[in-house]
């Protein structure tokens, strides 16, 4: 039956819900979070907020878990038949409600500190950046609950506790299928403190957020009286109006300002400046700060296509774009890394194809600027180095020697991170 | 070795549609671009445009938008060209080629695929 | 689009004589080219990438030279198996775009 406009009704990660209803949400990877209510308001506005357990009055409460609240035993609502959970099929592995698991190449803005996890909850696949502790040991171990790396002894970190996580749904958004990432999205900006320990209030793109982009609805998450409007696009921090434009900040390299960022009621659209190809004058000259070649003596108008430039050295060495993009689809990732160069003018893409965890295939490819510029599944990830790039071919070779022989998980996205060059490095050249 | 081998030539009529096929082998198929180029009688060679079998993200020479589809399937290592609205100009050698600038802009060819367009 | 402009459109050559055919693009193309061969019946073959990369199993006695708008494909010492058409190719910029091709014909 078709709404009539005239209806108000509330638009939720792609379901429809008529003014006054109320439901627990979807929380990626929590799956059903019992701990939330959400409520459909007479203007159409998703409201969401915290459930508050009262205290209770005896010795040893009881956990259940389709309720949020602990509860006394003697108020125990009676035992229905059990109910059997759908498990989940992911890359042609089953997993079973509520076990967690590891996933590659998801996040295209994993930055080195992070890992992706995943949990299974009722028939769906959630899966999230989890930002990992520092760690102060050299021979870390893995546990069965996290996807982070922990010093033997430590105690384990749960998964509601990590700070500045970003879920994401793989099954129905653009982990799995991204042929039209063509915006360049920053890394996620790590924020110091806590609002909440509840994930949602964390980010725009947070599970809430991401899943209202496209319906329009605005929908406020309420936990601990802090309020979050999804009208507008969040950027290293910062937060930008609908039309608003900036250059995006890309870690340790600061503003990248032959990029530029718009925001698209919640999405930030960014496109690369592309500067002319001819000029008015003989010798045009670059100038630092400036993204195009500018005439001498002429005053460097803000053109569309044409803004300021920031390299980006780094120890003295001038540092490159480097662009990444990952598909996976029946069981297989073909992974793309490239790194531009100014000469020659070029795009070096580093091609792996990997079937369960073996390197089925590995190439490299050289193409235009031109050409590259027209491939929309690219990101951009990182700037690096010349000698950078020179330890990760190199650690390439040898990992592609290895990992067609034998399984490989995690070893081209921790060689990957040789590229990113750290802040703190700064002071170490 | 690399092999890409196209179907059989094709007679349609005019208004009709043919689908081309070019099964690809001794190679990762889903690593590497696939192009396929038009070649009319005695003219030179047109590019039509290329499919990534990865990600399925297809460009086309403006020219051929609305006359080409191009798909792919991994699970095959097989690529297609699908031609619409036939018409005489569309009779041509269809050809598939391989794309990795590394080696060569287009390094293995199919043997072309002959579609002639007559009532 | 990249127009490639490629002459001569055909040409008549002796046997170990030294033949260049030229290919001019309408802007930069950053030596984005490659030329093929493409004998009668046939599928083409590529010669050079890159604008003076030869492929593996081509005869060194082609080379290929130019850079920004001009290329040019040279056969130091003509044989009887160079006889065929010759197009370039840029693939600097969508769409790729072939040059309209030289017929090489023995003198």
């Known amino acids: 039956e078709q709404v009539k406009h005239s209806e108000t009704y509330c638009m939720f990660q792609d379901k429809k819900y008529r003014v006054g209803e109320r439901w627990h949400p979807y929380l990626e990877p929590y799956g059903l979070v019992y701990c939330v209510n959400c409520i459909c308001s007479e203007n159409g506005n998703v409201l969401c907020s915290r459930v508050r357990c009262p205290n209770v009055h005896c010795l040893s409460p009881v956990h259940i878990p389709h309720l949020c609240c602990p509860r006394c035993p003697d108020s125990l609502p009676p035992v229905n038949n059990k109910v059997t959970s759908k498990s989940c099929e992911y890359n042609g592995t089953t997993y079973q409600h509520g076990e967690l698991f590891v996933a590659e190449g998801l996040f295209q803005n994993r930055q080195p500190n992070q890992c992706t996890q995943c949990s299974c909850s009722e028939g769906n696949v959630y899966c999230g950046l989890k930002t990992c502790p520092k760690l102060t040991c050299a021979f870390p171990v893995s546990v069965p609950d996290s996807c982070c790396r922990v010093c033997r002894g430590d105690g384990e970190l749960s998964w509601e506790h990590s700070d500045g996580d970003i879920f994401r749904q793989p099954a129905n958004r653009e982990a799995r299928h991204s042929y039209h990432r063509s915006h360049y999205d920053p890394p996620p900006s790590r924020q110091a403190g806590g609002l909440s320990r509840f994930p949602g209030a964390r980010s725009h793109r947070g599970a809430l957020m991401d899943s209202q982009q496209a319906s329009g609805t605005i929908v406020q998450i309420v936990i601990n009286n802090k309020h979050k409007h999804g009208q507008v696009c969040v950027s290293n921090g910062k937060t930008y109006s609908h039309g608003e434009s900036w250059h995006p900040n890309l870690r340790a390299f600061g503003i990248v300002e032959c990029v530029l960022c718009t925001c698209n009621v919640t999405k930030q659209e960014c496109k690369k400046i592309h500067c002319p190809n001819r000029y008015p004058c003989k010798y045009p000259q670059k100038i630092d700060g400036k993204c195009c070649k500018v005439c001498p003596g002429k005053k460097a108008k803000e053109l569309p296509g044409q803004s300021f430039d920031n390299k980006g050295y780094f120890c003295g060495e001038e540092t490159m774009p480097v662009y990444e993009s990952v598909f996976m689809e029946d069981g297989e990732t073909t992974r793309k890394i490239a790194l531009e160069t100014e000469r020659p003018p070029q795009v070096e893409v580093h091609v792996w194809t990997i079937r369960k965890g073996i390197l089925q295939h590995f190439h490299i490819e050289k193409i235009s600027k031109r050409m590259f510029e027209e491939l929309p599944h690219f990101k951009l990830v990182t700037r690096t180095t010349l000698s950078q790039w020179k330890i990760f071919t190199e650690g390439e070779a040898q990992i592609s020697q290895m990992c067609s022989s034998r399984v490989c998980r995690t070893e081209l996205e921790d060689l990957v991170k040789v590229l990113y060059l750290e802040r703190s490095e700064k002071g170490h050249c | 070795q690399v092999q890409l081998q196209q179907s059989g030539a094709e007679l349609a009529k005019p208004g009709a549609s043919v689908r081309l096929s070019c099964k690809a082998s001794g190679y990762s198929f889903s690593s590497y671009w696939m192009h396929w180029i038009k070649q009319r009688p005695g003219r030179g060679l047109e590019w039509i445009g290329y499919i990534d079998p990865s990600s399925r993200y297809t460009k086309y020479n403006l020219n051929f938008k609305d006359k080409a589809t191009l798909t792919a399937d991994k699970s095959s290592s097989t690529a297609y060209i699908l031609l619409t609205s036939l018409t005489y100009e569309d009779s041509a050698v269809y050809y598939c080629?391989?794309?990795?600038?590394?080696?060569?802009?287009?390094?293995?060819w199919g043997q072309g695929t002959s579609v002639t367009v007559s009532s | 689009d990249i127009k490639m402009t490629q002459s001569p459109s055909s040409m008549y050559a002796s046997l170990g004589e030294r033949v260049t055919i030229t290919c001019k693009a309408s802007?930069?193309?950053?030596?984005?080219l490659s030329w093929f061969q493409q004998k009668p019946g046939k599928s083409p073959k590529t010669l050079i990438y890159?604008?003076?990369r030869l492929v593996d199993g081509v005869p060194s006695r082609f080379s290929g030279s130019g850079s920004g708008q001009d290329y040019s494909l040279t056969i130091s010492s003509l044989e009887y198996e160079d006889m065929g058409i010759y197009y370039c190719l840029q693939y600097d910029e969508f769409p790729l775009t072939f040059g309209a091709g030289t017929k090489l014909e023995l003198k």
């Open positions: 890159r604008a003076n």
């Open positions: 802007q930069d193309i950053n030596s984005f």
């Open positions: 080629a391989t794309y990795s600038n590394y080696v060569g802009a287009m390094d293995y």
